[in-house]
Amino acid sequence: KESCDVQLYIKRQSYHSIFAGDPFKLECPVKYCAHRPQVTWCKLNGTTCVKLEGRHTSWKQEKNLSFFILHFEPVLPSDNGSYRCSANFLSAIIESHSTTLYVTDVKSASERPSKDEMASRPWLLYS
């Protein structure tokens, strides 16, 4: 019998390399049975995860999974960091693994490295 616990499918040590100025959607895949849980995003600040209140969010429904989406319209340099989603289910809090955004702050659109360049310069993601 399939478990009816809420599950959040963010992979351990997942990350996204993105550019400041681009739109980006950070998705939290949520599996639930009867009632969709309340889901929130937080951003890690040291060991504390600070709840992102009042941000642009939405839900997307697919066949067997829902996605709680945090929208970046667009990405800002300050968005660099690690994020976690959590679900409130039967008075319990279920937390996802954290996912990290590596934001490259390109000062001019013409300076943007190509995908090939990015692949050959992984250190750029961490600068």
């Epitope: 400041a20 100025g21 000062k107």
Partner: antibody, heavy 117, light 107 residues
Amino acid sequence: QVQLVQSGAEVKKPGASVKVSCKASGYTLTDYTIHWVRQAPGQRLEWMGWIYPGSGNTKYNDKFKVRVTITRDTSASTAYMELSSLRSEDTAVYYCARRNYYAMEYWGQGTTVTVSS
Amino acid sequence: DIVMTQSPDSLAVSLGERATINCKASQNVFTNVAWYQQKPGQSPKPLIYSASYRYSGVPDRFSGSGSGTDFTLTISSLQAEDVAVYYCQQYSTYPYTFGQGTKLEIK
């Protein structure tokens, strides 16, 4: 404190272009998007587009896409909105606004553009 | 485009009384709605974001509620300085769109 100061009123003939400036102070221009919104007499506010000054990336309302160009000069901490092929219905007050993650938080004082032959 | 429809178009309320302005979106905008106040000859001033979060410095007599397609701005006890036009705005889907405005006056 954060301030957005816009250029002065303009009177233009139909078919001409207008370029409105928005000078930011009290924060780093490249940290937030600048949006442009207009308000024609007796009409609702109308969102035109935004620029992310760090990279120059822009997003436009399709209604204005072929006629509007939003640019920035980071060294002057200034964003610009140019609207071409002006017609009488473009007569409006044009606002720049700084958006944080939520709403348009700080607004310029507005620039009145009058299109008249 | 998402159409934001406010009701009523104008509203007259006595000082100290409650004022309620409604905003209906033509499709689901989740909670991605802001409310602005605009006084004559001035730029819009943000009051509420994400449907119910008050901007710092905004008096707590202003409150917002709603999600999906139906939103409400409430002023719990009208003050003379609240006379203005109020606009809702959705930022869920491009292009961002505003309501037509509700003019609030003192009865």
